[in-house]
């Protein structure tokens, strides 16, 4: 008997449901009356769930487990674990006995994303160059233990004088506190990155400290670290600021916005005045705010082609630049579902289900699943075509052999907006026509 489980651990977020996949190859003439299926914890051999004597014997594990009874006869012995907790992490063994027998262990890796870190300074006022300051970075309710990295404004790692502590709460989730002690320079940005090693999820925050000092004329150019996300057709503000020295006048200012990669000019300010847009007349500065050091750029009626990195270059006597990324997005429409053939359907027929969703960006991720939420990956063909505006139309085709009845769901995910659009179709065992006639 061949018992198969995934090689890689199943990763599940705390509070969600997880499927521990397990399958076996039933021999001809196999009936469920012959089947013994036992799920147990690999280490302690504690019983989790079982099927015997032709029936589901239920959960022995906090009533949070279930089998897929309709799929057992086809050799699907997978276990559904609901409302996953940190304590569930570990190895589960799937043991199948008919006449022959076999077992295999599947690992469950539990994870929880860390919150965006909060940053505190001590002392937090009247700071001067040369002062020692303690910066604390705190992030909460993550699992497993985090990796914490500190870096300066140039991305150079800061490793000295860092103390990190991680404490688990009653649910086993960790709160992380990392402390960096630094001697202040003329000014500086300090970033703390809390990484979840399982989810490869980074949560970061930064603090910029500008100590009181005699003006030196040095220009500091600042832009947001994270990409600016803008919906197609809306307006976006690419933020950029600089620190004007006392006595600064706009007549001294050169401000250039350009595309980072090609250096194509986008917008400029020089000779004391706005030189206007060199980018399809869709850009504007904030002229009333320039004297205060606000060099932000407004980009109107955003298009897919605008996506990329924009550099803000400021030159007075000193000079500096920084690049800000624009990430363009467009939500996908609710999928429409079509069946082929779409009438006189019977169990055993092969049917093609097409899921179509329109005018999204960037490319979508498409997932199919059955009525039990089990992913359907076989016999799926997905195509994505960009139109003239660069927006994608998605068509995903699933070929299935009809069972007695079944629900098939298609989920179209926009990875940038984290927006899910879904459609589903239910096919019953009786001869039927799709869509159902009124």
């Amino acid at each position: 008997l061949e018992v198969q489980v995934p090689e890689d651990p199943v990763v599940a977020l705390v509070g969600t449901d997880a499927t521990l996949c397990c399958s076996f190859s039933p021999e001809p003439g196999f009936s469920l009356a012959q089947l013994n299926l036992i799920w147990q914890l690999t280490d302690t051999k504690q019983l989790v769930h079982s099927f015997a004597e032709g029936q589901d014997q239920g959960s022995a594990y906090a009533n949070r487990t279930a089998l897929f009874p309709d799929l057992l006869a086809q050799g699907n012995a997978s276990l559904r674990l609901q409302r996953v907790r940190v304590a569930d992490e570990g190895s589960f063994t799937c043991f199948v006995s008919i006449r022959d027998f076999g077992s295999a262990a599947v690992s469950l890796q539990v994870a929880a994303p860390y919150s965006k870190p909060s940053m505190t300074l001590e002392p937090n006022k009247d700071l001067r160059p040369g002062d020692t300051v303690t910066i604390t970075c705190s992030s909460y309710q993550g699992y497993p233990e985090a990796e914490v990295f500190w870096q300066d404004g140039q991305g150079v790692p800061l490793t000295g004088n860092v103390t990190t502590s991680q404490m688990a709460n009653e649910q086993g989730l960790f709160d992380v506190h990392s402390i960096l002690r630094v001697v202040l320079g003329a000014n500086g940005t300090y970033s703390c990155l809390v990484r979840n090693p399982v989810l490869q999820q980074d949560a970061h925050s930064s603090v910029t400290i500008t100590p009181q000092r005699s003006p030196t004329g040095a220009v500091e150019v600042q832009v947001p670290e994270d990409p600016v996300v803008a919906l197609v057709g809306t307006d976006a503000t690419l933020r950029c600021s600089f620190s004007p020295e006392p006595g600064f006048s706009l007549a001294q200012l050169n401000l250039i916005w350009q595309l980072t990669d090609t250096k194509q000019l986008v917008h400029s300010f020089t000779e004391g005045r706005d030189q206007g847009s060199a980018y399809a007349n869709r850009t504007a500065l904030f002229p009333d705010l320039l004297a205060q050091g606000n060099a932000s750029l407004r980009l109107q009626r955003v298009r897919v082609a605008d996506e990329g990195s924009f550099t803000c270059f400021v030159s007075i006597r000193d000079f500096g630049s920084a690049a800000v990324s624009l990430q363009v997005a467009a939500p996908y429409s609710k999928p429409s579902m079509t069946l082929e053939p779409n009438k006189d359907l019977r169990p055993g027929d092969t049917v093609t289900i097409t899921c179509s969703s329109y005018r999204g960006y960037p490319e979508a991720e498409v997932f199919w699943q059955d009525g039990q939420g089990v992913p359907l990956t076989g016999n799926v063909t997905t195509s994505q075509m960009a139109n003239e505006q660069g927006l994608f139309d998605v068509h995903s085709v699933l070929r299935v052999v009809l069972g007695a009845n079944g629900t098939y769901s298609c989920l179209v995910r926009n990875p940038v907006l984290q927006q899910d659009a879904h459609g589903s179709v239910t096919i019953t065992g009786q001869p039927m026509t799709f869509p159902p006639e009124a």
Epitope: G153, Q154, A186, N187, T216, G217, A218, V219, E220, V221, Q252, N254, I256, Q258, K263, L265, S268, T270, E271, Q275, T311, F313, S315, I316, R317, D318, F319, G320, S321
Partner: antibody, heavy 117, light 108 residues
Framework: EVQLVESGGGLVKPGGSLRLSCAAS????????MSWVRQAPGKGLEWVAA????????YYLDSVKGRFTISRDNAKNSLYLQMNSLRAEDTAVYYC??????????WGQGTSVTVSS | DIVMTQSPSSLSASVGDRVTITCRAS??????LAWYQQKPGKAPKLLVY???NLADGVPSRFSGSGSGTDYTLTISSLQPEDFATYYC??????????FGGGTKLEIK
Amino acid sequence: EVQLVESGGGLVKPGGSLRLSCAASGFTFSSYGMSWVRQAPGKGLEWVAAISGGGNYTYYLDSVKGRFTISRDNAKNSLYLQMNSLRAEDTAVYYCARQGLRVMDNWGQGTSVTVSS
Amino acid sequence: DIVMTQSPSSLSASVGDRVTITCRASENIYSNLAWYQQKPGKAPKLLVYAATNLADGVPSRFSGSGSGTDYTLTISSLQPEDFATYYCQHFWGIPPWTFGGGTKLEIK
């Protein structure tokens, strides 16, 4: 009076390294961006690298990017150019220059770099 | 990158002549242009900044003009000490801040 004095030039083999220094005086060094400019024998001026007053922004000529590093020590009123993986075409007189309001308003006397086997 | 095209590359003239050197940028540099004078074995010396402004101590026979992509350095009446090589340089946008190829002014 503004003064810029370069040093550190010399003869070096291809693939070798040199570090040029520029000592500044007569002005508030940390308030000014600085550049290095070079001039190959019998050729024109070529801008090489620039660094902002605080040292937090640096820019390079494409042909030296990854080989040369411009840096400064504002406490010592000094500008540096670390040159690695030197090539014959890097042979030149290297000048340091102070950036005024979008101009190089003061120049050093130059230091000579020869790359030859 | 912005390309600065300087012309002529060499020029012969006599004391007292009026001389014009031009510099053309490959795109609009919005008057962010400087002119330098260099004598053999010496460092360059600033003459004109922001296209039209004379640097301190530069004789009034030197003048700069132009806008957009086209700029001119004029010496109204050549003096013996003016024989040298002249360079333009732009300061528009993110470096490289390139120089023109130079104009060698020689005695006729």
